[in-house]
């Protein structure tokens, strides 16, 4: 059926009309209230505030950052936490409250000129001349996910696999790209016969993990050519 085709992990030669998705756990958007909840209605209030799941710092409020609530906690479960004040320990700029930044593991006050210089230097090193519109003062929008974040967890949007945490790769999911788990031994994988021969895959799988390769599963040799199952196997 169309739905079972849609739900296969790697869809090739996309038959219209597939695709399009929204939402995943731990990453509802913390947009400015005026965007999702305009007009000053009650949805803007935080009466019933509860820990808010996130995948990136930018999804949290200006005075929050995204992290696991417990030290050494489950990396997959992250919530928006209150920003850290001056002289508190930090690992990245986004952890520090507005007007501060992370230097040598401590939140310090931003001497604006100095702070801006440090940011631009970091960007230039990592991303070439990608700072033409940088405003060193608007911390939350300019220190975007590509810079001061911890690596993306499963489900985080990414541009390349280096954006993702260890054990994850950056792969297509619907029309976007997210961090997905690198495949383990015995897991189904996608084998492309030739580069460019596979059509549109809107649900890409990651590659097989270290020491594994994507090969035809032994008991599927007899199956028809089109339905042969490939799995990650030891070299």
């Amino acid at each position: 059926t169309l739905n079972s085709v849609l739900n296969s992990n790697a869809i090739k030669n996309l038959p219209p009309p597939l695709g399009g998705a929204a939402g995943h756990p731990g990453s509802a958007v913390s947009a400015a209230p005026g965007i999702l909840y305009p007009g000053g209605n009650k949805y803007q209030t935080i009466d019933n505030y509860q820990p808010y799941p996130c995948a990136e710092d930018e999804e949290c409020g200006t005075d929050e950052y995204c992290a696991s609530p417990t030290r050494g906690g489950d990396a997959g479960v992250q919530i928006c936490l209150a920003c850290r004040k001056r002289r508190k320990r930090c690992m990245r700029h986004a952890m520090c409250c507005p007007g501060n930044y992370c230097k040598n593991g401590i939140c310090v006050s931003s001497d604006q000129n100095n702070f801006r210089g440090e940011i631009e230097e970091t960007i230039t090193e990592s991303f070439g001349n990608d700072h033409s519109t940088l405003d060193g003062y608007s911390r939350r929008t300019t220190l975007s996910s590509k810079m001061y974040h911890s690596k993306g967890q499963e489900g985080s949007v990414c541009l390349r696999s280096s954006d993702c945490a260890t054990g994850l790769c950056c792969a297509r999911h619907f029309w976007s790209k997210i961090c997905k788990p690198v495949l383990k031994e015995g897991q189904v994988c996608t084998k492309h016969r030739r580069k460019g021969s596979h059509g549109l895959e809107i649900f890409q799988r990651c590659y097989c993990g270290e020491g594994l390769s994507c090969r035809i599963q032994k008991d599927h040799h007899q199956a028809s050519n089109s339905s042969r199952l490939h799995t990650c196997q030891r070299h």
Partner: antibody, heavy 114, light 112 residues
Framework: QVQLVESGGGVVQPGRSLRLSCAAS????????MHWVRQAPGKGLEWVAV????????YYADSVKGRFTISRDNAKNTLYLQMNSLRAEDTAVYYC???????WGQGTLVTVSS | DIVMTQTPLSLSVTPGQPASISCKSG???????????LYWYLQKPGQPPQFLIY???NRFSRVPDRFSGSGSGTDFTLKISRVEAEDVGIYYC?????????FGQGTQVEIK
């Protein structure tokens, strides 16, 4: 802040063209698939088009196929909808929408009238 | 296209009383990634959609906890435990597992 802001709407005569823009800010725009959705006055929402994160793949609703073109400029964090051969039935508020962590803009009104 | 059918189409509720809206999809919205791509949103006149619930049961940031979503596969429900005056408007369900994204016809909620 994380937001989408549409612009380019207005009053246009049938058969003419219009280009809508959607400026994204506060998130990694180039990693997300982006959609256009519209709402005719007093009606429900209708999905219009999608473009993949890299701009390589596009898909359209039958009602706009061949007339509308979705595109994006990741360097400018901007999504576009080029609307040609406009008809009265294209009159609607047009919203750009981000998938996965769903986010919509405030919308821009397009009125097609002679 | 996946057809989304909402019931009832209109609901008149006394403040403080509960309200419940049903949404049925023409096919399962469960993806093999384990997620079910069903949303609920509220729309007020002249305003864009205000998203309330994502993936069946997860509340968006700063949505009051009187809103809750439940269901699986093809049958879904939005519940408001105690309706307040500002909850009036049209509630829609939406699926995004398959293009085109499709929407319920809407349920108009008004205060008695």
């Amino acid at each position: 802040q994380v937001q989408l802001v549409e612009s380019g709407g207005g009053v246009v005569q049938p058969g003419r063209s219009l280009r809508l823009s959607c400026a994204a800010s506060g998130f990694t725009f180039s990693g997300y698939g982006m959609h256009w959705v519209r709402q005719a006055p007093g009606k429900g929402l209708e999905w219009v088009a999608v473009i993949s994160y890299d701009g390589n793949d596009k898909y359209y609703a039958d009602s706009v196929k061949g007339r509308f073109t979705i595109s994006r400029d990741n360097a400018k964090n901007t999504l576009y909808l080029q609307m040609n051969s406009l008809r009265a039935e294209d009159t609607a508020v047009y919203y750009c929408a981000r998938e996965l962590r769903v986010l919509w803009g405030q919308g821009t009104l397009v009125t097609v009238s002679s | 296209d996946i057809v989304m059918t909402q019931t009832p189409l209109s609901l008149s509720v006394t403040p403080g009383q509960p309200a419940s809206i049903s949404c049925k999809s023409g096919q399962s919205l469960l993806h093999n990634d384990g997620k079910t791509y069903l949303y609920w949103y509220l729309q007020k006149p002249g305003q864009p959609p205000q998203f309330l619930i994502y993936e069946v049961s997860n509340r968006f940031s700063r949505v009051p906890d009187r809103f809750s979503g439940s269901g699986s596969g093809t049958d879904f429900t939005l519940k408001i435990s105690r309706v307040e005056a500002e909850d009036v408007g049209i509630y829609y369900c939406m699926q995004s597992i398959q293009l085109p994204w499709t929407f319920g016809q809407g349920t108009q909620v008004e205060i008695k």
